[in-house]
């Protein structure tokens, strides 16, 4: 996949000491709406990698047809390959399902590059390594696509976990998670632990390795350390949040915080990179370059195009700064920060140089549609999508890649005033345009 773009579409100091487990203040919150504790059956149910997406096994139809489905918090359709395609090992065969119902309606989803189109229907769906339930859900049977499926990614469909407002063809098409919550006793919450390997994986290694966990209906304590800190979901369409401050190695970027959220900031597992609005990207890169100025890297590296390679095991992580995003907290005038390491924003790339080398792409890129906290951010954290309480929680992931000197961190509280002013209000007229151009 290219750097930092919507995943299915194409290929955007100062942490707590290692091993420190902070007290979990949040454990004392009421248990509802999401069950807490152990979800053994769901742990390690994801495979994949940031560059090609993380997928979960699902079954569709009667008798059940097994498919690997990309977990995407940046869209709201459940859509699966339903016709032969050179990049698909298998696809949904509606004619073989006795429980398939045709909705006699088409759906067309164009992206900035590429598209998919298909036919809408419903069928019985379950997640083998998820809650022990079966639901009737809307399914878009993809019959035609361009630059959507990824060669070698091993997934055949996409599970859009965002809200109905951005569902296609319109918000009347109930997303899968809404159907799941409505039809079962599963609490209205899910959590994601995406585990970046820290080194490139070839296809067979991806198939054999664990990519992380999607806990449906709850929070698993074993997947994080320290405390969970929550930020409000600003609006239920994408998982929109508000960034109030950005620091590079503790140095404030000192921009008007509206710039950080222009025109929105979202948490999106279906995007590879941390994508930043143009002005913010330029300031961030300038600051990262300054922090690592003992070295000079090619222009194409900062564009996410050229790879930089070091002798295996000698990547100078210490010359690259940590990046902190401060998010609006749940309490007035209170924020918290999430801090990622270069181990998250330098993405290991498969064997392009020699086996003696470790090669990386810069996984921060420019966006014209706001900030996207993609897989490279999420790989540092256990992320709780608490839909019931309209909030997103972050804690340090138990599987994040770090070194002996620095670790990813989630820290707070910090006093931040006028955080509401950091949100950007999208003019109503622009919205329909934005919806079709998801770069």
């Amino acid at each position: 996949t290219q750097h930092g773009i919507r995943l299915p579409l194409r290929s955007g100091l100062g942490g707590a000491p290692l091993g420190l487990r902070l007290p979990r203040e949040t454990d004392e919150e009421p248990e509802e709406p999401g069950r807490r504790g152990s979800f053994v059956e769901m742990v390690d149910n994801l495979r994949g990698k940031s560059g090609q997406g993380y997928y979960v096994e699902m079954t569709v139809g009667s008798p059940p047809q097994t498919l690997n489905i990309l977990v995407d918090t940046g869209s709201s359709n459940f859509a699966v390959g339903a016709a032969p395609h050179p990049f698909l090992h298998r696809y949904y065969q509606r004619q073989l399902s006795s429980t398939y119902r045709d909705l006699r309606k088409g759906v067309y989803v164009p992206y900035t590059q590429g598209k998919w189109e298909g036919e809408l229907g419903t069928d019985l769906v379950s997640i083998p390594h998820g809650p022990n339930v079966t639901v009737r859900a809307n399914i878009a049977a993809i019959t035609e696509s361009d630059k959507f499926f990824i060669n070698g990614s091993n997934w055949e469909g996409i599970l859009g976990l965002a809200y109905a407002e951005i569902a296609r063809p319109d918000d009347s098409l109930e997303p899968f998670f809404d159907s799941l919550v409505k039809q079962t006793h599963v609490p209205n919450l899910f959590s994601l632990q995406l585990c970046g390997a820290g080194f490139p994986l070839n296809q067979s290694e991806v198939l054999a390795s664990v990519g992380g966990s999607m806990i449906i209906g709850g929070i698993d304590h074993s997947l994080y350390t320290g405390s969970l800190w929550y930020t409000p979901i600003r609006r239920e369409w994408y998982y929109e949040v508000i960034i109030v401050r950005v620091e590079i190695n503790g140095q404030d970027l000192k921009m008007d915080c509206k710039e950080y959220n222009y025109d929105k900031s979202i948490v999106d597992s279906g995007t590879t990179n941390l994508r930043l609005p143009k002005k913010v990207f330029e300031a961030a890169v300038k600051s990262i370059k300054a922090a690592s100025s003992t070295e000079k890297f090619p222009d194409g590296f900062w564009l996410g195009e050229q790879l930089v390679c070091w002798q295996a095991g000698t990547t100078p992580w210490n010359i690259f700064p940590v990046i902190s995003l401060y998010l609006m907290g749940e309490v007035t005038n209170q924020s918290f920060r999430i801090t990622i390491l270069p181990q998250q924003y330098l993405r290991p790339v498969e064997d392009v140089a020699t086996s003696q080398d470790d090669c990386y792409k810069f996984a921060i890129s420019q966006s014209s549609t706001g900030t996207v906290m993609g897989a490279v951010i999420m790989e540092g954290f256990y992320v709780v999508f608490d839909r019931a309480r309209k909030r997103i929680g972050f804690a340090v992931s138990a599987c994040h890649v770090h070194d002996e000197f620095r670790t990813a961190a989630v820290e707070g509280p910090f006093v931040t005033l006028d955080m509401e002013d950091c949100g950007y209000n999208i003019p109503q007229t622009d919205e329909s345009t934005l919806m079709t151009g998801r770069a």
Partner: antibody
Framework: QLQLQESGPGLVKPSETLSLTCTVS??????????WGWIRQPPGKGLEWIGM???????WYNPSLRSRVTISVDTSKNQFSLKLSSVTAADTAVYYC????????????WGRGTLVTVSS | EIVLTQSPATLSLSPGERATLSCRAS??????LAWYQQKPGQAPRLLIY???KRATGIPARFSGSGSGTDFTLTISSLEPEDFAVYYC??????????FGGGTKVEIK
Amino acid sequence: QLQLQESGPGLVKPSETLSLTCTVSGGSISSSSYYWGWIRQPPGKGLEWIGMIYYSGSTWYNPSLRSRVTISVDTSKNQFSLKLSSVTAADTAVYYCARVGHGVSYFDLWGRGTLVTVSS
Amino acid sequence: EIVLTQSPATLSLSPGERATLSCRASQSVSSYLAWYQQKPGQAPRLLIYDASKRATGIPARFSGSGSGTDFTLTISSLEPEDFAVYYCQQVYTWPPRTFGGGTKVEIK
């Protein structure tokens, strides 16, 4: 205009250390826009990248030569140098110094080259 | 490791003719490819960078094209001074260490 000139002995004995210097004139080696590199070409053969250095002293080496190569910079003299230890006849080549420009990716300016023969 | 294969090894042409040189990468290098010209007894000279951009002072008869794995250097009408060896180099993986084996353009 900027020019590069290699200098050093043309004959080195096997097992000894080859030492070359590249003098940069008409511009500063301390420019933040460039790396400074060494490339060699055995007689009748193709080009082989040896390594390069930034004015800060940061170095990058060809993995196949890494254990034997040292590149250093002297900003006060506007020079950078190559040392290749434990040489054999296979190290006989024309050695070029070059500037790495165009987004520090391409060798956009070369010295004339100097032939170094390894022989007893 | 990315390997660059140049073809043909030798190209025999007359002045005024069009020369087409090929460089194939073992995997995609995007547009991060350069072409160099080397005349006998001289140092190489950068002709084309980023697959299609002419370096300073390079005549318009030299053009580069391609992206991904297949690249072409075209000399629209050979001048006597163009008979030389041409090398391609990829910098998709950096540092810039991979050169092709070269194509010799000789007078027919």
